[in-house]
Interface confidence: low
């Protein structure tokens, strides 16, 4: 007879898997011993391998649910073309039977006691139910038995009382506008909304419960710009060290506008970021020396000659100066203390002279006295002899300038009865008073 041929046999379940097709003979299907076959769809699956016993099935349930019974299990000879041990043909079942006991004793029914009293009504107002109970103990059931029927029964009850109405909140109202236009100020901006206990209102007779919770709530406003923060001065910093090593100096303290830093357009700190103080080292400052003005030139002389006056003989003369005022390790005066030059002496020499042009007008004298006048002069100016202007004193030292020195005796023709000086005087006009400018300011 033709069979259904499968490519697999599942040992654990005994099922055929992977249908190859139908209408073939057992012999053709079992050319591959890994295959399996069924004589009809849903029928027993037999593997093509040589026959052997399947695994034992699980034990069937015990034949009774209480006291001692028995239970069966089986195995099957599965395979083709041969026999299982014991010369059993494929498809044959082998059985095992054993004693079993699910529960030692069998349940026995119990009996009810009488009904107990009715419990109070389930509600304190309007209509409800009331209940009474009985016990399963006349007699008590045995071995898991029970009493037939219900352990409690209920009936309607009426309290004859009107029920109170408890309050419930209506929906929240809208949020109020923000209490400020910016955040971060002394009062954080908030918006508030409220609701009414009116959905429904609590009854007064009998009194209903008020609504639970709050009638309003607040929250902070979001999306607002930050409030301007005015700057505040931090503490004064340390006093800077005295910048001088002697005498008086000036020290400084600084502070920063960061307590707080101005923010969001707030104003900067008012006032100064620095303040100064006088500091005193109590150490006198060094005073550098300063040259006095040069002294007079010494007479123009030449060593080993008694006089060179009125002669074309160069001499030498010197002048000195003093370094004054140096104190407290101040600098010494720079430069030479003595100055030497070459000279021709015209001291008391009679020289031909000529009258000079008028000098410029001098200052008004006396400046603060009565009737000040100014003067100008013409002088009898000597004509200096044409001596060489330079000399070479020592070989290799180059040319040295030679200067005329001394007060000659110039000789001019008389002018307005004068031989040396002609003077002209004029009064000064519109003379202002001498006043101390400091006193004038006061």
């Amino acid at each position: 007879d033709p069979v259904l041929c499968f490519t697999q046999y599942e040992e654990s379940s005994g099922k055929c898997k992977g249908l190859l097709g139908g209408g073939v003979s057992v012999e053709d299907c079992c050319l591959n011993t890994a295959f399996a076959y069924q004589k009809r769809s849903g029928g027993l699956c037999q593997p093509c391998r040589s026959p052997r016993w399947s695994l034992w099935s699980t034990w069937a349930p015990c034949s009774v649910t209480c006291s001692e019974g028995s239970q069966l299990r089986y195995r099957r000879c599965v395979g083709w073309n041969g026999q299982c041990s014991g010369k059993v043909a494929p498809g044959t079942l082998e059985w095992q039977l054993q004693a079993c006991e699910d529960q030692q004793c069998c349940p026995e029914m119990g009996g009810w006691s009488g009904w107990g009293p009715w419990e109070p009504c389930s509600v304190t107002c309007s209509k409800g139910t009331r209940t009474r109970r009985r016990a399963c103990n006349h007699p008590a059931p045995k071995c898991g038995g029970h009493c037939p029927g219900q352990a409690q029964e209920s009936e309607a009850c009426d309290t004859q009382q009107v029920c109170p109405t408890h309050g419930a909140w209506a929906t929240w109202g809208p949020w109020t506008p923000c209490s400020a236009s910016c955040h971060g100020g002394p009062h954080e901006p908030k918006e508030t909304r409220s609701r009414k206990c009116s959905a429904p209102e609590p009854s007064q007779k009998p009194p209903g419960k008020p609504c639970p919770g709050l009638a309003y709530e607040q929250r902070r406003c979001t999306g607002l710009p930050p409030c301007p923060v005015a700057g505040g001065w931090g503490p004064w910093g340390p006093v800077s060290p005295c910048p001088v090593t002697c005498g008086l100096g000036q020290t400084m303290e600084q502070r920063t506008c960061n307590h707080p830093v101005p923010q969001h357009g707030g104003p900067f700190c008012a006032g100064d970021a620095t303040r100064t103080h006088i500091c005193n080292t109590a150490v006198p400052c060094p005073v550098d020396g300063e040259w006095d003005s040069w002294g007079e030139w010494s007479p123009c002389i030449r060593r080993n000659m008694k006089s060179i006056s009125c002669q074309e003989i160069p001499g030498q003369q010197s002048r000195g100066r003093t370094c004054r005022g140096r104190k407290f390790d101040g600098h010494r005066c720079a430069g030479q203390q003595q100055d030497i030059r070459h000279c021709y002496s015209i001291q008391h020499c009679p020289l031909k002279g000529s009258w000079s042009e008028w000098s410029t007008w001098g200052l008004c004298m006396p400046p603060c006295g009565p009737n000040p006048t100014r003067a100008r002069q013409r002088l009898c100016t000597p004509l200096l002899p044409k001596y060489p202007p330079t000399v070479s004193m020592v070989e290799g030292q180059g040319e040295k300038n030679v200067t005329f020195w001394g007060r000659p005796l110039p000789r001019c023709e008389e002018l307005q009865g004068q031989k040396l000086v002609v003077e002209e005087k004029r009064p000064c006009l519109h003379v202002p008073a001498c006043k101390d400018p400091e006193e004038e300011e006061l």
Epitope: H183, H187, E188, L214, E217, Q218, R219, R220
Partner: nanobody, 119 residues
Framework: EVQLVESGGGLVQPGGSLRLSCAAS????????MAWVRQAPGKQRELVSE???????VYADSVKGRFTISRDNSKNTLYLQMNSLRAEDTAVYYC?????????????WGQGTLVTVSS
């Protein structure tokens, strides 16, 4: 003074979850509102969610249904459970507390915790 310390940020893949915590200390009895605020790179701070003292919650439209704010008063801690995270949730998340007393209010901020959503 109120001190706020955030934790729980990190790197997570799109669709993943994170739970941020904010531990509050100091004068916490006068806190009336707490909030989570985030700031993405180059953008302004944006309110994510807030919770009032009585438990009222508010969420930004962009996080509704994905984020849950809660607070544990016994631990003085604020939480933000973030589910179904998206790349646009990448930001520094700040914990914010609003303190209000008779003499005035103050805004307190944590140092922030970075949340990065990236595959």
């Amino acid at each position: 003074e109120v001190q706020l310390v955030e934790s729980g940020g990190g790197l997570v893949q799109p669709g993943g979850s994170l739970r941020l915590s904010c531990a509050a200390s100091g004068r916490i009895s006068s806190i009336i509102h707490m909030a989570w605020v985030r700031q993405a790179p180059g953008k302004q701070r944006e309110l994510v969610s807030e919770i009032s003292r009585v438990g009222t919650t508010v969420y930004a439209d962009s996080v509704k249904g994905r984020f849950t704010i809660s607070r544990d008063n016994s631990k003085n801690t604020l939480y933000l459970q973030m589910n179904s995270l998206r790349a646009e949730d990448t930001a520094v998340y700040y914990c914010n507390a609003l303190q209000y007393e008779k003499h005035g209010g103050a805004d307190y901020w944590g140092q922030g915790t970075l949340v990065t959503v990236s595959s």
